[in-house]
Amino acid sequence: MAVTACQGLGFVVSLIGIAGIIAATCMDQWSTQDLYNNPVTAVFNYQGLWRSCVRESSGFTECRGYFTLLGLPAMLQAVRALMIVGIVLGAIGLLVSIFALKCIRIGSMEDSAKANMTLTSGIMFIVSGLCAIAGVSVFANMLVTNFWMSTANMYTGMGGMVQTVQTRYTFGAALFVGWVAGGLTLIGGVMMCIACRGLAPEETNYKAVSYHASGHSVAYKPGGFKASTGFGSNTKNKKIYDGGARTEDEVQSYPSKHDYV
Protein backbone atom coordinates (compact mmCIF):
# COMPACT_ATOMS: atom_id res chain seq x y z
CA MET A 1 0.00 0.00 0.00
CA ALA A 2 2.84 2.37 0.97
CA VAL A 3 4.62 1.52 -2.28
CA THR A 4 1.52 2.37 -4.36
CA ALA A 5 1.13 5.65 -2.47
CA CYS A 6 4.79 6.56 -2.94
CA GLN A 7 4.64 5.72 -6.64
CA GLY A 8 1.38 7.60 -7.16
CA LEU A 9 2.61 10.65 -5.27
CA GLY A 10 5.87 10.59 -7.19
CA PHE A 11 3.94 10.52 -10.45
CA VAL A 12 1.69 13.46 -9.42
CA VAL A 13 4.61 15.55 -8.13
CA SER A 14 6.56 14.89 -11.34
CA LEU A 15 3.52 15.74 -13.45
CA ILE A 16 3.16 19.11 -11.68
CA GLY A 17 6.91 19.69 -12.03
CA ILE A 18 6.98 18.97 -15.75
CA ALA A 19 3.93 21.19 -16.30
CA GLY A 20 5.88 23.89 -14.47
CA ILE A 21 8.99 23.35 -16.63
CA ILE A 22 6.86 23.69 -19.79
CA ALA A 23 5.23 26.85 -18.37
CA ALA A 24 8.60 28.38 -17.44
CA THR A 25 10.06 27.61 -20.88
CA CYS A 26 7.13 29.35 -22.59
CA MET A 27 6.99 32.34 -20.23
CA ASP A 28 8.27 35.75 -21.33
CA GLN A 29 9.34 36.94 -17.88
CA TRP A 30 12.80 35.40 -17.61
CA SER A 31 14.38 38.81 -17.04
CA THR A 32 13.18 42.38 -16.70
CA GLN A 33 14.97 45.57 -17.66
CA ASP A 34 14.59 48.88 -15.87
CA LEU A 35 16.22 52.20 -16.62
CA TYR A 36 17.17 54.11 -13.50
CA ASN A 37 17.14 57.45 -15.23
CA ASN A 38 14.58 56.84 -17.96
CA PRO A 39 14.42 60.24 -19.66
CA VAL A 40 11.49 59.59 -21.95
CA THR A 41 8.47 57.81 -20.53
CA ALA A 42 7.37 54.87 -18.38
CA VAL A 43 8.09 51.70 -20.35
CA PHE A 44 8.71 48.26 -18.85
CA ASN A 45 10.73 45.62 -20.72
CA TYR A 46 10.83 41.90 -20.04
CA GLN A 47 12.41 39.04 -21.93
CA GLY A 48 11.98 35.32 -22.32
CA LEU A 49 13.86 32.58 -24.13
CA TRP A 50 11.95 33.17 -27.34
CA ARG A 51 10.87 36.81 -27.45
CA SER A 52 11.18 40.25 -25.89
CA CYS A 53 8.20 42.28 -24.71
CA VAL A 54 7.41 45.87 -23.86
CA ARG A 55 4.61 47.03 -21.60
CA GLU A 56 3.69 50.69 -21.48
CA SER A 57 2.13 52.57 -18.58
CA SER A 58 -1.07 52.78 -20.65
CA GLY A 59 -1.30 48.98 -20.51
CA PHE A 60 -0.28 48.43 -24.13
CA THR A 61 1.90 45.31 -24.49
CA GLU A 62 3.81 44.14 -27.54
CA CYS A 63 6.20 41.22 -28.02
CA ARG A 64 8.74 40.44 -30.72
CA GLY A 65 10.45 37.12 -31.31
CA TYR A 66 14.20 36.66 -31.64
CA PHE A 67 14.28 35.96 -35.34
CA THR A 68 18.03 35.62 -35.53
CA LEU A 69 20.04 32.69 -34.21
CA LEU A 70 23.48 34.13 -34.93
CA GLY A 71 22.96 37.26 -32.85
CA LEU A 72 21.90 35.34 -29.76
CA PRO A 73 24.35 34.53 -26.94
CA ALA A 74 25.56 30.92 -26.83
CA MET A 75 24.40 30.78 -23.20
CA LEU A 76 20.82 31.53 -24.26
CA GLN A 77 20.98 28.73 -26.82
CA ALA A 78 22.31 26.40 -24.12
CA VAL A 79 19.44 27.35 -21.78
CA ARG A 80 16.91 26.68 -24.55
CA ALA A 81 18.49 23.27 -25.18
CA LEU A 82 18.52 22.33 -21.49
CA MET A 83 14.86 23.28 -21.03
CA ILE A 84 13.77 21.37 -24.16
CA VAL A 85 15.77 18.28 -23.13
CA GLY A 86 14.16 18.53 -19.70
CA ILE A 87 10.67 18.69 -21.21
CA VAL A 88 11.29 15.79 -23.63
CA LEU A 89 12.78 13.55 -20.92
CA GLY A 90 9.99 14.47 -18.55
CA ALA A 91 7.30 13.73 -21.14
CA ILE A 92 8.84 10.31 -21.92
CA GLY A 93 9.16 9.67 -18.18
CA LEU A 94 5.48 10.46 -17.67
CA LEU A 95 4.51 8.12 -20.48
CA VAL A 96 6.61 5.29 -19.04
CA SER A 97 5.42 5.92 -15.48
CA ILE A 98 1.74 5.71 -16.48
CA PHE A 99 2.28 2.09 -17.56
CA ALA A 100 4.42 1.46 -14.48
CA LEU A 101 1.74 2.53 -12.00
CA LYS A 102 0.80 -0.34 -9.70
CA CYS A 103 -2.85 0.67 -9.71
CA ILE A 104 -3.07 0.26 -13.50
CA ARG A 105 -3.31 -3.29 -14.88
CA ILE A 106 -1.96 -3.86 -18.38
CA GLY A 107 -2.26 -7.46 -19.50
CA SER A 108 -0.15 -9.82 -17.43
CA MET A 109 2.67 -7.37 -16.73
CA GLU A 110 4.83 -8.69 -13.91
CA ASP A 111 5.92 -6.70 -10.88
CA SER A 112 9.53 -6.89 -11.99
CA ALA A 113 8.67 -5.18 -15.29
CA LYS A 114 6.72 -2.49 -13.45
CA ALA A 115 9.64 -2.03 -11.08
CA ASN A 116 12.04 -1.54 -14.00
CA MET A 117 9.68 0.94 -15.67
CA THR A 118 9.25 2.83 -12.39
CA LEU A 119 13.03 3.06 -12.00
CA THR A 120 13.43 4.19 -15.62
CA SER A 121 10.80 6.92 -15.26
CA GLY A 122 12.29 7.96 -11.92
CA ILE A 123 15.73 8.41 -13.45
CA MET A 124 14.17 10.34 -16.35
CA PHE A 125 12.39 12.66 -13.92
CA ILE A 126 15.60 13.23 -11.97
CA VAL A 127 17.54 14.12 -15.14
CA SER A 128 14.62 16.27 -16.37
CA GLY A 129 14.53 18.19 -13.09
CA LEU A 130 18.30 18.65 -13.14
CA CYS A 131 18.14 19.96 -16.73
CA ALA A 132 15.50 22.54 -15.75
CA ILE A 133 17.39 23.64 -12.64
CA ALA A 134 20.64 23.85 -14.64
CA GLY A 135 18.95 25.83 -17.44
CA VAL A 136 17.39 28.37 -15.09
CA SER A 137 20.62 28.67 -13.09
CA VAL A 138 22.70 29.25 -16.24
CA PHE A 139 20.31 32.01 -17.32
CA ALA A 140 20.40 33.60 -13.85
CA ASN A 141 24.20 33.44 -13.90
CA MET A 142 24.23 35.02 -17.37
CA LEU A 143 22.14 37.92 -16.05
CA VAL A 144 24.32 38.42 -12.99
CA THR A 145 27.68 38.21 -14.78
CA ASN A 146 26.93 39.87 -18.13
CA PHE A 147 23.97 42.15 -17.71
CA TRP A 148 23.13 42.75 -14.06
CA MET A 149 24.05 46.43 -13.81
CA SER A 150 25.32 47.49 -17.19
CA THR A 151 26.41 51.11 -17.24
CA ALA A 152 26.84 52.11 -20.83
CA ASN A 153 28.30 55.24 -22.37
CA MET A 154 26.50 55.95 -25.62
CA TYR A 155 28.02 57.95 -28.44
CA THR A 156 25.92 58.93 -31.42
CA GLY A 157 27.72 60.07 -34.52
CA MET A 158 30.73 62.37 -34.72
CA GLY A 159 30.92 64.52 -31.61
CA GLY A 160 27.54 63.22 -30.51
CA MET A 161 26.08 63.49 -27.04
CA VAL A 162 27.30 61.10 -24.40
CA GLN A 163 24.59 59.59 -22.20
CA THR A 164 25.43 57.34 -19.27
CA VAL A 165 22.53 54.97 -18.70
CA GLN A 166 22.15 52.38 -15.99
CA THR A 167 20.07 49.43 -17.07
CA ARG A 168 19.08 47.16 -14.19
CA TYR A 169 18.29 43.54 -14.99
CA THR A 170 16.22 41.61 -12.49
CA PHE A 171 15.12 37.98 -12.23
CA GLY A 172 11.74 37.38 -13.82
CA ALA A 173 8.95 35.14 -12.52
CA ALA A 174 9.89 32.36 -14.97
CA LEU A 175 13.18 31.77 -13.15
CA PHE A 176 11.42 31.03 -9.88
CA VAL A 177 8.80 28.89 -11.63
CA GLY A 178 11.64 26.96 -13.30
CA TRP A 179 13.55 26.40 -10.07
CA VAL A 180 10.47 25.19 -8.19
CA ALA A 181 9.27 23.03 -11.11
CA GLY A 182 12.72 21.47 -11.54
CA GLY A 183 12.85 20.73 -7.82
CA LEU A 184 9.41 19.10 -7.87
CA THR A 185 10.34 16.96 -10.87
CA LEU A 186 13.53 15.93 -9.09
CA ILE A 187 11.63 15.02 -5.89
CA GLY A 188 9.05 13.10 -7.94
CA GLY A 189 11.85 11.16 -9.61
CA VAL A 190 13.43 10.26 -6.29
CA MET A 191 10.04 9.08 -5.01
CA MET A 192 9.62 6.87 -8.09
CA CYS A 193 13.06 5.34 -7.50
CA ILE A 194 12.14 4.66 -3.87
CA ALA A 195 8.85 3.08 -4.99
CA CYS A 196 10.78 0.88 -7.42
CA ARG A 197 12.55 -0.83 -4.50
CA GLY A 198 9.22 -1.80 -2.98
CA LEU A 199 7.86 -3.06 -6.28
CA ALA A 200 10.78 -5.36 -7.03
CA PRO A 201 10.06 -8.97 -5.94
CA GLU A 202 12.24 -10.16 -3.05
CA GLU A 203 14.65 -12.70 -4.44
CA THR A 204 15.13 -15.80 -2.25
CA ASN A 205 18.57 -17.24 -1.79
CA TYR A 206 17.49 -20.78 -2.63
CA LYS A 207 15.43 -22.66 -5.14
CA ALA A 208 12.72 -24.77 -3.62
CA VAL A 209 13.29 -28.49 -4.06
CA SER A 210 10.43 -30.85 -4.85
CA TYR A 211 10.72 -34.46 -3.76
CA HIS A 212 9.50 -37.34 -5.86
CA ALA A 213 10.20 -40.57 -4.01
CA SER A 214 10.31 -43.44 -6.48
CA GLY A 215 10.40 -46.20 -3.89
CA HIS A 216 11.01 -47.24 -0.26
CA SER A 217 14.74 -47.49 -0.73
CA VAL A 218 15.29 -43.71 -0.72
CA ALA A 219 18.22 -42.89 1.50
CA TYR A 220 17.64 -39.72 3.46
CA LYS A 221 20.77 -37.68 3.80
CA PRO A 222 20.71 -35.26 6.71
CA GLY A 223 21.46 -31.64 5.95
CA GLY A 224 19.59 -31.74 2.71
CA PHE A 225 17.77 -28.53 3.45
CA LYS A 226 20.76 -26.58 4.61
CA ALA A 227 20.44 -24.54 1.44
CA SER A 228 17.45 -22.77 2.92
CA THR A 229 19.78 -20.55 4.90
CA GLY A 230 21.77 -19.78 1.83
CA PHE A 231 25.01 -20.78 3.58
CA GLY A 232 25.05 -24.57 3.81
CA SER A 233 27.03 -27.04 1.82
CA ASN A 234 24.28 -27.15 -0.77
CA THR A 235 23.99 -23.59 -1.94
CA LYS A 236 24.41 -24.64 -5.57
CA ASN A 237 21.27 -26.82 -5.50
CA LYS A 238 23.12 -30.02 -6.28
CA LYS A 239 21.23 -33.31 -6.34
CA ILE A 240 21.11 -34.59 -2.80
CA TYR A 241 18.81 -37.54 -3.38
CA ASP A 242 19.36 -40.26 -5.89
CA GLY A 243 15.83 -41.50 -5.58
CA GLY A 244 14.11 -39.03 -7.85
CA ALA A 245 14.52 -35.75 -5.99
CA ARG A 246 15.11 -33.05 -8.55
CA THR A 247 15.59 -29.31 -8.35
CA GLU A 248 12.89 -27.16 -9.77
CA ASP A 249 15.02 -26.22 -12.74
CA GLU A 250 15.06 -29.87 -13.74
CA VAL A 251 11.37 -30.45 -13.10
CA GLN A 252 10.48 -27.40 -15.22
CA SER A 253 7.83 -26.12 -12.81
CA TYR A 254 7.90 -22.41 -11.91
CA PRO A 255 5.96 -21.65 -8.75
CA SER A 256 5.53 -18.05 -7.57
CA LYS A 257 7.51 -16.69 -4.65
CA HIS A 258 4.67 -17.65 -2.30
CA ASP A 259 4.64 -21.37 -3.19
CA TYR A 260 6.73 -23.41 -0.80
CA VAL A 261 7.18 -27.15 -1.06
Epitope: Q33, L35, N38, P39, V40, T41, V43, N45, Q47, S52, V54, E56, S57, S58, G59, F60, T61, E62, R64, Y66, T68, L70, G71, L72, P73, L76, F147, S150, A152, M154, T156, Q163, V165, T167
Partner: nanobody, 122 residues
Framework: QVQLVESGGGLVQPGGSLRLSCAAS????????MGWYRQAPGKQRELVAA????????NYADSVKGRFTISRDNSKNTLYLQMNSLRAEDTAVYYC???????????????WGQGTLVTVSS
Protein backbone atom coordinates in the same frame (compact mmCIF):
# COMPACT_ATOMS: atom_id res chain seq x y z
CA GLN B 1 26.10 50.87 -33.55
CA VAL B 2 22.94 52.98 -33.42
CA GLN B 3 22.63 56.40 -35.01
CA LEU B 4 20.01 59.10 -34.54
CA VAL B 5 19.97 61.71 -37.29
CA GLU B 6 17.92 64.89 -36.80
CA SER B 7 16.85 67.25 -39.54
CA GLY B 8 14.40 70.09 -40.19
CA GLY B 9 15.85 72.82 -37.99
CA GLY B 10 16.46 76.39 -39.17
CA LEU B 11 15.44 80.01 -38.92
CA VAL B 12 11.75 80.85 -38.70
CA GLN B 13 9.70 83.93 -37.89
CA PRO B 14 7.51 84.12 -34.76
CA GLY B 15 4.14 82.49 -35.40
CA GLY B 16 5.69 80.32 -38.09
CA SER B 17 5.97 76.50 -38.32
CA LEU B 18 8.71 73.89 -38.57
CA ARG B 19 8.75 70.12 -38.78
CA LEU B 20 11.65 68.25 -37.18
CA SER B 21 12.41 64.63 -37.93
CA CYS B 22 14.71 62.07 -36.32
CA ALA B 23 15.63 58.81 -38.04
CA ALA B 24 17.01 55.91 -35.99
CA SER B 25 19.21 53.32 -37.69
CA UNK B 26 21.54 50.47 -36.75
CA UNK B 27 21.15 47.19 -34.90
CA UNK B 28 17.77 48.10 -33.41
CA UNK B 29 15.64 45.26 -32.09
CA UNK B 30 12.72 47.51 -31.18
CA UNK B 31 11.99 51.06 -30.06
CA UNK B 32 10.37 51.59 -26.68
CA UNK B 33 9.95 55.32 -26.91
CA MET B 34 11.41 58.44 -28.48
CA GLY B 35 11.30 62.07 -27.49
CA TRP B 36 12.45 65.59 -28.18
CA TYR B 37 14.48 67.65 -25.70
CA ARG B 38 15.66 71.20 -26.09
CA GLN B 39 18.46 73.26 -24.58
CA ALA B 40 18.44 77.03 -24.84
CA PRO B 41 21.74 78.91 -24.36
CA GLY B 42 22.65 79.00 -20.67
CA LYS B 43 19.71 76.85 -19.65
CA GLN B 44 19.13 73.23 -18.60
CA ARG B 45 18.00 70.66 -21.10
CA GLU B 46 14.24 70.08 -20.85
CA LEU B 47 11.76 67.59 -22.22
CA VAL B 48 9.58 68.96 -25.03
CA ALA B 49 7.55 65.91 -25.99
CA ALA B 50 7.80 62.12 -25.93
CA UNK B 51 5.94 59.20 -27.51
CA UNK B 52 5.92 55.45 -26.97
CA UNK B 53 6.38 53.55 -30.22
CA UNK B 54 4.06 50.68 -29.44
CA UNK B 55 0.92 52.29 -28.08
CA UNK B 56 1.62 55.85 -29.14
CA UNK B 57 1.16 57.37 -25.68
CA UNK B 58 2.31 60.99 -25.71
CA ASN B 59 3.70 63.36 -23.10
CA TYR B 60 4.15 67.13 -23.59
CA ALA B 61 5.78 69.92 -21.63
CA ASP B 62 3.21 72.46 -20.42
CA SER B 63 4.88 75.25 -22.40
CA VAL B 64 4.27 73.52 -25.77
CA LYS B 65 0.86 71.90 -25.25
CA GLY B 66 -1.55 72.77 -28.06
CA ARG B 67 1.24 74.11 -30.28
CA PHE B 68 3.54 71.13 -30.83
CA THR B 69 2.55 67.66 -32.02
CA ILE B 70 4.78 64.60 -31.72
CA SER B 71 4.27 61.59 -34.01
CA ARG B 72 6.17 58.52 -35.20
CA ASP B 73 6.45 56.21 -38.19
CA ASN B 74 7.12 52.70 -36.89
CA SER B 75 8.01 51.25 -40.28
CA LYS B 76 10.73 53.87 -40.82
CA ASN B 77 11.88 54.11 -37.18
CA THR B 78 11.38 57.85 -37.49
CA LEU B 79 10.17 60.47 -35.01
CA TYR B 80 8.56 63.78 -35.96
CA LEU B 81 7.83 67.03 -34.15
CA GLN B 82 5.40 69.45 -35.79
CA MET B 83 5.96 72.90 -34.28
CA ASN B 84 3.30 75.55 -34.86
CA SER B 85 2.85 79.11 -33.51
CA LEU B 86 6.55 79.35 -32.72
CA ARG B 87 7.74 81.94 -30.22
CA ALA B 88 11.11 83.52 -29.53
CA GLU B 89 11.41 81.44 -26.33
CA ASP B 90 11.29 78.27 -28.44
CA THR B 91 14.76 79.09 -29.76
CA ALA B 92 17.08 76.25 -28.74
CA VAL B 93 19.03 73.21 -29.90
CA TYR B 94 16.52 70.35 -30.22
CA TYR B 95 17.82 66.90 -29.39
CA CYS B 96 16.28 63.58 -30.36
CA UNK B 97 16.25 60.92 -27.66
CA UNK B 98 15.53 57.21 -28.09
CA UNK B 99 14.91 54.43 -25.57
CA UNK B 100 15.84 51.35 -27.62
CA UNK B 101 16.35 47.62 -27.40
CA UNK B 102 19.53 46.80 -29.28
CA UNK B 103 21.07 43.52 -30.45
CA UNK B 104 19.97 39.91 -31.00
CA UNK B 105 19.19 39.24 -27.33
CA UNK B 106 18.35 42.89 -26.80
CA UNK B 107 19.83 45.23 -24.25
CA UNK B 108 17.97 48.36 -23.33
CA UNK B 109 19.86 51.61 -23.91
CA UNK B 110 19.18 55.30 -24.33
CA UNK B 111 20.66 57.18 -27.27
CA TRP B 112 20.86 60.86 -28.12
CA GLY B 113 21.16 62.66 -31.42
CA GLN B 114 23.60 65.49 -32.14
CA GLY B 115 20.88 68.11 -32.12
CA THR B 116 19.41 70.55 -34.64
CA LEU B 117 19.21 74.29 -34.07
CA VAL B 118 15.84 76.06 -34.22
CA THR B 119 15.95 79.85 -34.22
CA VAL B 120 12.74 81.88 -33.90
CA SER B 121 13.47 85.47 -34.77
CA SER B 122 11.98 88.29 -36.79
Amino acid sequence: QVQLVESGGGLVQPGGSLRLSCAASGSIFSINAMGWYRQAPGKQRELVAAITFGGGSTNYADSVKGRFTISRDNSKNTLYLQMNSLRAEDTAVYYCNADLLVGGFPRRNVYWGQGTLVTVSS
